[in-house]
């Protein structure tokens, strides 16, 4: 079974800068899985943001601006990254990665 680890306990960024979060996958080949990213804003329900599937297809939540989040995966390091562009106060949240094994 796959295992996920998010090595960064927290990330502090200046407004309008870029934040990059990592999710390390072990126990399974990352290119044979789909990785999903979610966020939980304080006091709000958890929300799907974006995913990258085994074939590289990227899907994002409807209504999220196309340039806001970028998802990638690096097979060499078995890592998925979530990039948050133009960081603003609304981006303050806990971000989770999840795995779907094909």
């Amino acid at each position: 079974a796959g295992h996920l680890e998010q090595p960064q306990i927290s990330s502090t960024k200046t407004l309008s800068k870029t934040a990059r979060l990592e999710c390390v996958v072990s126990g399974i080949t990352i290119s044979a899985t789909s990785v999903y990213w979610y966020r939980e804003r304080p006091g709000e329900v958890i929300q799907f943001l974006v995913s990258i599937s085994y074939d590289g297809t990227v899907r994002k939540e409807s209504g999220i601006p196309s340039g806001k989040f970028e998802v990638d995966r690096i097979p060499e390091t078995s890592t998925s990254t979530l990039t948050i562009h133009n960081v603003e106060k609304q981006d303050i949240a806990t971000y989770y990665c999840a795995l779907w094994e094909v």
């Epitope: 899907r59 409807s62 196309s66 970028e70």
Partner: nanobody
Framework: EVQLVESGGGVVQPGGSLRLSCAAS????????MGWLRQAPGKGREFVAA????????YYADSVKGRFTISRDNSKNTVYLQMNSLRAEDTAVYYC??????????????????WGQGTLVTVSS
């Protein structure tokens, strides 16, 4: 509402080249990931190539890798498909499609929000 208009199709000899264009109007072009799909006579619609919202990521069907190149110019609201080393089996109607929320080879037909009318490419000697 987004309007997509393809152009550039035609008849070409095997080994030849064509460049398809797809001009978009009616909405913010960069809000959409773009794809090219094709339908050969008597066959289903199949994925050819796709490009992400920003243009930073491209995808290709195995059958066209190394021969076709997809690109986009967000300032011109246009996506292109450069087709080289064309083969008889590339003969099809080529469709441009736009998706708000999906980019890549796995996007299902219903995940594309808008479609062009199609342009016919015939590869024949």
């Amino acid at each position: 509402e987004v309007q997509l208009v393809e152009s550039g199709g035609g008849v070409v000899q095997p080994g030849g080249s064509l460049r398809l264009s797809c001009a978009a109007s009616g909405s913010t072009f960069s809000d959409f990931a773009m794809g090219w799909l094709r339908q050969a006579p008597g066959k289903g619609r199949e994925f050819v190539a796709a490009i992400s919202w920003t243009g930073g990521r491209t995808y290709y069907a195995d059958s066209v890798k190394g021969r076709f190149t997809i690109s986009r110019d967000n300032s011109k609201n246009t996506v292109y498909l450069q087709m080289n080393s064309l083969r008889a089996e590339d003969t099809a109607v080529y469709y441009c499609a736009a998706s708000r929320d999906c980019s890549g080879p796995g996007c299902r037909v219903h995940e594309y929000d808008y479609w062009g009318q199609g342009t016919l490419v015939t590869v024949s000697s």
